[in-house]
């Protein structure tokens, strides 16, 4: 009943809660003397489900047969007409649509560490959609049975409250659950387990790592446990990786030596337990311990290479390049690079340790024979030294490989392919491949990269510090025994027109024709390698095409002479550069007029 | 300090009903669980049923399971014992007894112990004639 029903009542039958599909007899009856006032004949009875009409009568009942009513909870509702007036409310009913409970699937109970309590869960099954109460019992030693009930909509957990003990853990216990509506009831298979089965132990807390003598070779494990664990599980990775390792162990005690351990790196840890061999599940995971394994010497060498420039006629500068140890090979953080210069016949020896550089420069005199040795160290000791005798790389114009090409090879990589050198080939021990930044003065002070290839290969794919539109100067070096020889070619990894041409700085007449002379473009408007430099001039005034003269690219090359001019005519000249990619735009312009003699 | 008062007691044929109450008064703030238990003449106490105060989780002997059925009005601290199918061996006094441990409930082992329960009425004779 919705209302105080003053006026009449609504009755339902069978029941106001019935079976989805099920039919429902509604009766709306008027109280004596409650009908209109005068009119008891002209009594318009009207039923509202919700707010739609879905049935009338004249006269003091009505009786109407409702049938496909859907899941939930539906409103009827009975009002009066009378002539002249408004509906009035006579009374009201709800009717609770569902169906009875399904049986409770996969009850599975746990109890979370030893002193954590009993809680159970369960599948409902589908909603009922009408008030449905679960009764979980528990069964077990002592014959007694524990029963707790859930009121909540939407049962699927309860906790019982009780803590197993292992006082005897092979007893069993059992549970069900049971759910009861006005519709019926059903309960769950039952789940019979022992103490064993269903405590879940806590995860290990406490985790710390110890290096004995700092060795990681000697690396144990501690952890805090609960008191009957049996077995656990250990995993651990380098931070950096996605993989774990596994290992699992029997009566540990908390305690386990790690013997793969790799020296200077950061792992992960963590622990799980259980308290059987093959009853009970495995706890959560633990926290994470993080720790850095202690460092060990550098193992491996170290990748070195080097120029040779001359200065005058005693002296020679080189310059000794070195890559850094993987962080396998430095095995910790390398401190210093201990450099050793050597003259060999006459045995001096110069050594200097280099910190915060992966190069170091000297001069040294043009005669004699010269060796380096160059090692990586650590707090624990150094790396073997890469020694290396200085000699002229270009010297062997026999070993020069042939052929050498570069090509844009996809996005910032340039494959550079090259021919055997006509020597014996077999005499190649190894080629290197040695790429830096074109920079106009021949800086010293750009960046030099290099890769070995083994000497079957006749091609390498430079992507190291390769950016677009810059040129690269590229060498390949054939390396046999004591004697080089080397190939050098300009390469980009992609191009465009330059953005600017050259900028003329000076005109200047000599014996009848002219020197011109420019500033080089801008490295980053270069766009590229540049193929050629154009010299442009006309007549000034004049609206004839202008004539032009194409200069091969020459790095060092900033100036050019130009004969064809005519004597007191006043010319304007400019420049242009090309890539393979195009022109660029005019560069200054200069008005010149030669003061000669005509011919 | 608490008072425990059984009543509801006396003959009934077997297969009939009774239910007992145990009302508590004076400190029932500190009620965490109550319980019943019976002696029957020439034997030993044992325990039937019990009932945790915080979340209504009940606890039955098998022997009693189905037929004694405990239950509680927190509102007025009474907790109470429908006795249905009675069997002449249901025959003795019946105890109403209480405990202030929070921890009652939590060990399966302790809750049927008389040990566990601090506080006992005097008892109420329950007869079931054949």
């Known amino acids: 009943k919705i209302d105080a029903c003053k006026r009449g009542d609504v009755t339902v039958k069978p029941s106001h809660v019935i079976l989805l599909g099920s039919t429902v007899n509604i009766t709306c009856s008027l109280k004596p003397r409650q009908g209109c006032f005068h009119y008891s004949r002209r009594n318009k009875l009207i039923l509202y489900k919700f707010d739609r009409r879905i049935n009338f009568h004249h006269g003091h009942s009505l009786n109407s047969q409702v049938t496909g009513l859907p899941l939930g909870t539906t409103l009827f509702v009975c009002k009066l007409a009378c002539i002249n007036s408004d509906e009035i409310q006579i009374c009201g009913a709800e009717i609770f649509v569902g169906v009875a409970p399904e049986q409770p699937q996969n009850l599975s109970c746990i109890q979370k560490g030893e002193q954590g309590t009993v809680a159970c869960t369960w599948e409902r099954g589908r909603d009922t959609h009408l008030y449905t109460e679960y009764t979980l019992q528990l069964s077990g030693p002592k014959n007694l049975t524990w029963q707790k009930q859930c009121k909540d909509i939407y049962c699927d957990y309860l906790d019982f409250g009780i803590n197993l003990t292992p006082e005897s853990p092979e007893s069993n216990f059992t549970a069900k659950v049971t759910a009861v509506n006005s519709l019926g009831s059903s309960s769950s298979l039952p789940s019979t387990f022992t103490f064993l089965d269903i405590v879940r132990p806590l995860p290990p807390w406490d985790i710390r790592i110890k290096f004995q003598k700092a060795s990681v070779s000697r690396c144990t494990l501690y952890w805090r446990d609960e008191g009957l664990v049996l077995l656990n599980r250990l995993r651990y990775r380098p931070s950096n990786s996605r993989l774990w390792n596994m290992v699992n162990v029997t009566k540990a005690k908390g305690r386990h030596d790690l013997l793969d351990l790799k020296p200077f790196t950061e792992y992960e840890f963590q622990i799980s337990s259980k308290l059987h061999l093959y009853k009970g599940s495995w706890s959560d995971w633990s926290e994470s311990l993080r720790a850095q394994t202690p460092e060990e010497e550098p193992t491996g060498m170290l990748d070195v290479w080097y120029m040779k420039r001359h200065i005058d006629y005693s002296r020679q500068q080189i310059s000794l390049f070195w890559k850094n140890l993987s962080v396998s090979e430095a095995r910790g953080k390398i401190l210093h690079y201990q450099v050793t210069l050597q003259e060999l016949t006459g045995g001096k020896a110069m050594t200097q340790n280099i910190t915060g550089h992966t190069s170091w420069t000297t001069v040294i005199p043009r005669t004699g024979n010269w060796a380096v040795a160059v090692s990586a160290a650590n707090s624990k000791g150094s790396s073997l030294p890469t020694r290396i005798n200085i000699m002229n790389l270009c010297e062997a114009g026999l070993l020069a490989p042939r052929q050498v090409s570069a090509n844009s090879e996809g996005m910032d990589n340039i494959l550079v392919t090259w021919q055997p050198p006509r020597k014996d080939p077999s005499a190649v021990q190894e080629y290197v491949v040695e790429w830096r930044e074109l920079h106009p003065g021949g800086d010293t002070q750009v960046p030099l990269n290099w890769l070995r290839s083994r000497p079957y290969n006749v091609s390498a794919l430079i992507s190291e510090n390769i950016k677009s539109y810059i040129c690269y100067e590229i060498r390949v070096y054939a390396l046999s025994g004591d004697q080089g020889g080397c190939s050098s070619i300009l390469g980009n990894s992609k191009h465009k027109a330059p953005l600017s041409g050259p900028h003329i700085n000076a005109i200047t007449e000599e014996k009848g024709s002219i020197l011109i002379s420019w500033n080089s473009i801008p490295v980053q408007e270069q766009m590229g390698c540049l193929l050629h430099y154009r010299i442009y001039w006309k007549e000034r005034d004049s609206n004839s095409q202008p004539q032009l003269c194409e200069i091969p690219y020459r790095v060092s090359q900033n100036s050019h002479p130009i004969n064809s001019l005519q004597p007191r005519v006043t010319y304007v000249l400019w420049m242009t550069a090309l890539t393979a990619a195009g022109e660029s735009s005019h560069g200054n312009e200069r008005e010149f007029c030669l003061q000669g003699k005509a011919n | 300090q608490l008072q425990l008062v059984e009543s509801g007691g006396g003959l009934v044929q077997a297969g009939g009903s009774l239910r007992l109450s145990c009302a508590a008064s004076?400190?029932?703030?500190?009620?965490?669980?109550m319980g019943w238990f019976r002696q029957a003449p020439g034997k030993e106490r044992e325990f039937a049923a019990a009932?945790?105060?915080?979340?209504?989780?009940?606890i039955h002997a098998d022997s009693v399971k189905g037929r004694l059925t405990i239950s509680r009005d927190n509102a007025k601290n009474t907790v109470y014992l429908q006795m249905n199918s009675l069997k002449p061996e249901d025959t003795a006094v019946y105890y109403c007894?209480?405990?202030?441990?929070?921890?009652?409930?939590?060990?399966?082992?302790?809750?049927?112990?008389?040990?566990?329960?601090?506080?006992w009425g005097q008892g109420t004779q329950v007869t079931v004639s054949s």
């Open positions: 007894a209480a405990t202030s441990n929070p921890q009652f409930g939590r060990n399966w082992y302790t809750v049927a112990a008389g040990v566990e329960y601090g506080y």
């Open positions: 004076g400190r029932t703030f500190g009620i965490h669980g």
């Open positions: 009932i945790r105060w915080s979340d209504g989780t009940t």
